[in-house]
Interface confidence: low
């Protein structure tokens, strides 16, 4: 962008520039290329030798510019077209400038010479005109632009030196170049004056537009000597909740029903299914009533809900064990992280309230977090009613105020073999016999018909065991070796069959010596 400091064509009255000597440059009304009347300066003292004619503009304020450009429109008479012209005829003139802090020039100051004036250049015509051209009003107007700098004072004067030409200075425009205020890469760069040299690059620091933030390096844009912005460094991007519109010059809040979770170039996106925004500029969408977002769910994922209950439960009871199978819920809640929990309630033999099952119940593969729709449950009590709830849960179950949906199944366990005998003790012993007694199993699961006792010598293998039956919970085992250790195990039998053997118990018969001693102790004194 060019900012004009002075333009001679806009003058409505005399320009009134200073000339030296008075016989040199002359202000006359002339015409521009469009035949508009303008104020011009002419000089044509070609027949007089040693010409040194100066023309000085009025004081021109710099207005912060560092480099000044001067556009001159002029026409120069072709020396060869002037009859009997002396060799001193020139087709060029010189351009000078002089810096000052205020308008201090007089008729004699600054001196009319190259020092103190600073020469910018010798200006030559690209085309000169001949007498014929003038007569036909065809003017060959030259346009030349020269620049100088750096300038640092408040202002300056320009001077044009003629040294023997025939020319007309038609227009003089003085300007500087600046880069305009611009919004680029999401940043505002304020109007910046070009540098002091033609090759200067002036760095302008940008500030992010409203609702944008810096992404990378300091936001910089360079203004070149021609008043053009070069490629920017760094950028700003609309922050979360805002999107770029109007060619990236505005960060607009996401319209209602849309959101943007992160800073970046991307546009706002529609709220995922089952969510909505409550205002403009949303960084996330709020789930509708009854729908939730798990902690690790991305913000662009639909809101989901809890699953419905499992369906079509099938139970298969075998004595005190149970296989449960079911089909998945009709509605998974829109999620893929569905698992099942099993809640076991024991209802005794059918009367009274149910209670949570004890820790002795076994679940395979596990009670909670089942991924497959089946479970094997064992170690239940015989002849007992149970209620099993199969809960369907997913990643948002914890967020819901409602309990998980479940399917319920009631079962009753069958007759089962008795549990193991837990305690066995020795009543008496001799060199070849041991009398044992034991308590009834904790869970007889019916009427005990009899017991089976298995025993073998500790030094021998279990394969050598002998089994004997006893209708009561006491038995005397005969025919044993003196002083030997025997291993004993007992199990109970009901109509449902044998229970598990008890743990191994070790008892020893008397040695001969012990037996003799015990007899002596029993003899009367």
């Amino acid at each position: 962008v060019e900012e004009t400091l002075m333009d001679s064509t806009t003058a409505t009255a005399e320009l009134g520039w200073m000339v030296h000597p008075p016989s040199g440059w002359e202000e006359v009304s002339g015409y521009d290329e469009n035949m508009n009347t303008i104020r011009t300066y002419q000089v044509c003292n070609v027949f007089e030798s040693s010409q040194n004619n100066w023309l000085r503009t009025k004081f021109i304020r710099r207005r912060g510019a560092h480099r000044i450009h001067v556009e001159m429109k002029f026409s120069v008479r072709d020396c060869s077209s002037i009859p009997s012209v002396p060799g001193s005829c020139k087709e060029t003139f010189n351009l000078y400038y002089y810096e000052a802090d205020f308008d201090l020039a007089t008729k004699t100051f600054p001196n009319w010479m190259e020092n103190p004036w600073v020469k910018v250049d010798t200006i030559a015509a690209d085309e000169s005109f001949s007498q014929v051209d003038l007569g036909g009003r065809v003017m060959k107007i030259n346009t030349e632009v020269r620049s100088f700098g750096p300038v640092s004072r408040n202002g300056f004067y320009l001077a044009f030196q003629d040294y023997g030409g025939c020319m007309s200075l038609i227009a003089v425009r003085v300007f500087y170049r600046k880069c305009p205020r611009i919004i680029q890469n999401g940043a505002i760069f304020q109007e910046t004056l070009s540098g002091a040299e033609s090759t200067s690059l002036v760095a302008a620091r940008g500030s992010c537009i409203a609702n944008a933030e810096e992404v990378d390096v300091p936001i910089k844009l360079y203004c070149n000597g021609d008043g053009e912005w070069l490629v920017p460094i760094g950028r700003c991007m609309c922050k979360a909740g805002f999107e770029a519109v109007e060619n990236g010059t505005v960060c607009r809040g996401c319209p209602s029903g849309t959101f943007k979770a992160n800073q970046g170039d991307e546009a706002c996106t529609h709220c995922p299914i089952n969510s909505r925004t409550t205002s403009e500029g949303a960084t996330n969408c709020v789930c509708r009533n009854g729908y939730y977002r798990a902690d690790l769910d991305p913000l662009d994922m639909p809101c989901t809900t809890i699953p419905s209950a499992p369906q079509a439960v099938i139970s298969s009871v075998n004595e005190t064990s149970l296989m449960l199978e079911w089909t998945p819920p009709r509605d998974s809640g829109g999620r893929e992280d569905l698992v099942y929990n099993i809640i076991c309630k024991s209802c005794g033999s059918g009367r009274g309230a149910c209670t949570r099952c004890g820790d002795n119940v076994q679940y395979a593969p596990r009670q909670l977090g089942l991924t497959e729709p089946r479970i094997y449950i064992s170690d239940l009590l015989a002849h007992t009613q149970y209620t099993f709830e199969i809960q369907a849960v997913n990643g948002v179950t914890d967020q819901s105020p409602f309990s998980p949906q479940f399917a319920s199944v009631n079962i009753t366990t069958n007759q089962a073999a008795p549990s193991a005998v837990s305690i066995m003790h020795q009543v008496s012993r001799t060199v070849d016999s041991i009398t044992l007694s034991w308590s009834q199993p904790d869970q007889p699961n019916g009427v005990i018909l009899d017991y089976e006792l298995q025993y073998y010598e500790k030094e021998l293998s279990e394969y050598n065991a002998t089994a004997i039956k006893s209708p009561t919970n006491t038995v005397t085992v005969q025919g044993l070796k003196a002083g030997a250790i025997y291993v004993f195990q007992v199990r109970a039998r009901t109509v449902a069959g044998y229970g598990r053997y008890s743990g191994k118990m070790y008892f020893q018969t008397m040695t001969e010596a012990e037996y003799q001693t015990s007899i002596k102790e029993k003899l009367p004194l």
Partner: antibody
């Protein structure tokens, strides 16, 4: 907590080069620019330049453009190499971080690396 | 480059007194886009690295005692210590964070009588 741990003191001869390090911990290394500042004995602070660890982009004070070279390694470490050493380079050199967004200042500084250039 | 001029270069005060130091920049440090002044104040105690006290001309860094206050805009800035303590013995630097190259003032040395 945030820490910038700089390498130990260096003694170098005129004309030589040195490379000092600054290991960052306690924060996301790529979220902050790493700046370097020079302080001659009993003098003020001079900004050398910075590097953006996430892109490797550098910007230097023109005065140090031919003197300092800033680099980063993925191991949360920034480096500054000083070349063609003279006695004028004898100073304490600090690394300091500056947040990329919203916050305009250098909030944590290393303890400094002392460089002595002597024949 | 922006020149930062600090005054006074040093001052000596008694504990409990109010201390005011000034910082003048050769160009405005006000970012017209976000109306923030890109100026920071640092404290440097002997043998230690500088420590950030104030950023954005007036925002106190977390953990900095509230006796430290920054003010000013454009080219003129002030750091005030409302009631100086013995541990405030240090050199205080202002810093242009507006334009590259970043520049620091020459510092104001605070001595405790």
């Amino acid at each position: 907590q945030v820490q910038l741990q700089q390498s130990g003191a260096e003694l170098a001869k005129p004309g030589a080069s040195v490379k000092m390090s600054c290991k960052a911990s306690g924060y996301t290394f790529t979220s902050y620019w790493m700046h370097w500042v020079k302080q001659r004995p009993g003098q003020g602070l001079e900004w050398i330049g910075f590097i953006n660890p996430s892109t490797g982009y550098t910007d230097y004070n023109q005065k140090f453009k031919d003197k300092a070279t800033l680099t980063v390694k993925s191991s949360n470490t920034a480096y500054m190499q000083l070349s063609r050493l003279t006695s004028e380079d004898s100073a304490v050199y600090y690394c300091t971080r500056r947040l990329k967004l919203l916050r305009y200042a250098m909030d944590y500084w290393g303890q400094g690396t002392t460089l002595t250039v002597s024949a | 480059d922006i020149v930062m001029t600090q005054s006074p270069s040093s001052l000596s005060v008694s504990a409990g007194e109010k201390v005011t130091m000034n910082c003048k920049s050769s160009q405005s440090l006000l970012n017209s886009g976000n109306q923030e002044n890109y100026l920071a104040w640092y404290q440097q105690k002997p043998g230690q690295p500088p420590k950030l006290l104030i950023y954005g001309a007036s925002t106190r860094e977390s953990g900095v005692p509230d006796r430290f206050t920054g003010s000013g805009s454009g080219t003129d800035f002030t750091l005030t210590i409302s009631s100086v303590q013995a541990e405030d013995l240090a050199v205080y630097y202002c810093q242009n964070d507006h334009s590259y190259p970043f520049t620091f003032g020459a510092g104001t040395k605070v001595e405790i009588k």
